[in-house]
Amino acid sequence: AILGRSETQECLFFNANWEKDRTNQTGVEPCYGDKDKRRHCFATWKNISGSIEIVKQGCWLDDINCYDRTDCVEKKDSPEVYFCCCEGNMCNEKFSYFPEMEVTQPTSNPVTPKPPYYN
């Protein structure tokens, strides 16, 4: 393994649609992929009137947008379905939403809000 890179071998698996899809609802998914490709974990969820509903969690494969992310954080502003990915075993157990603000000149000292974490 390359130094500094978190190898992902398994991820938390969750399927909200498990009864219809006839899978387990939750478990641990082993991640497989070509040896030269990176493996990640992901989480996807909805925010229904302030209530978090997880849709899916599991393995994700070789997406440059997931490289070197140790935390699973959605940065898009108000997506319909939230999505985050990360590297490291079970790194999708916790996920958060921390939208990137438009870059504007601050009129006072900027405050970095702490991202809300869900699990």
Partner: antibody, heavy 120, light 107 residues
Framework: QVQLVQSGAEVKKPGSSVKVSCKAS????????ISWVRQAPGQGLEWMGG????????NYAQKFQGRVTITADESTSTAYMELSSLRSEDTAVYYC?????????????WGQGTMVTVSS | EIVMTQSPSSLSASVGDTVTITCRAS??????LAWYQQKPGKAPRLLIY???VLPSGVPSRFSGSGSGTHFTLTISSLQPEDFATYFC?????????FGPGTKLEIK
């Protein structure tokens, strides 16, 4: 690298059944999601259902519910698709396919296909 | 079930051209959208998964974009081997459904 090898072409009578096999070689078969997809001559692709062998339970498209049975034998790394009450419109190439992940990211490895012809 | 539509159903282009194929889902599928290439008599080949990620061995002239209900496949600098039929597929919700296909022909 996983390879999927399917059984040979079949000619069947209407009302009968067909069972197509798909043998996997390579990595841990039991951990993969295996799907079955069919393609009628000159037509598009149709997902029939899938199975994760370690779970053992299969998931079917409503259209085929009650007519299709998908199973997997971990000891021989073989998946099976049985379709019953065959009719002429079931004439198609049947593919077994491995998915990238349990959450169905994409169908990355395809068998060579099995032509099933239903004719009286 | 989620209905997938593709446009155009066929198009003609020349080697070196850039072409774009559109796929729409009848309801949101987040990023669970894959693209496949199929040549006559052959099994389909996975070109893009997760709406935008290229698997091993797929040339970088292929690219995908989109999220939710609207997706595109772009092939830049068309090569002779790219003339084929292209299908999109959603795997967000069962039954997983394919688009009807787009046939890319040589002009």
């Amino acid at each position: 690298q996983v390879q999927l090898v399917q059984s040979g072409a079949e000619v069947k009578k209407p009302g009968s059944s067909v069972k197509v096999s798909c043998k996997a070689s390579g990595e841990s078969f039991e951990h993969f999601q295996i799907s079955w997809v069919r393609q009628a001559p000159g037509q598009g692709l149709e997902w029939m259902g899938g199975i994760i062998p370690i779970y053992g339970t299969a998931n079917y498209a409503q259209k085929f519910q009650g007519r299709v049975t998908i199973t997997a034998d971990e000891s021989t790394s073989t998946a099976y698709m049985e379709l019953s009450s065959l009719r002429s419109e079931d004439t198609a190439v049947y593919y077994c396919v491995k998915d990238l992940t349990w959450t169905n990211l994409g169908l990355d490895i395809w068998g060579q296909g099995t032509m099933v012809t239903v004719s009286s | 079930e989620i209905v997938m539509t593709q446009s155009p159903s066929s198009l003609s282009a020349s080697v070196g051209d850039t072409v774009t194929i559109t796929c729409r889902a009848s309801q949101g599928v987040s990023r669970w959208l894959a693209w496949y290439q199929q040549k006559p008599g052959k099994a389909p080949r996975l070109l893009i998964y997760g709406a935008r990620v290229l698997p091993s061995g797929v040339p970088s002239r292929f690219s995908g974009s989109g999220s939710g209900t609207h997706f595109t496949l772009t092939i830049s600098s068309l090569q002779p081997e790219d003339f084929a039929t292209y299908f999109c597929q959603q795997s967000y919700s069962t039954p997983f459904t394919f688009g009807p296909g787009t046939k890319l022909e040589i002009k």
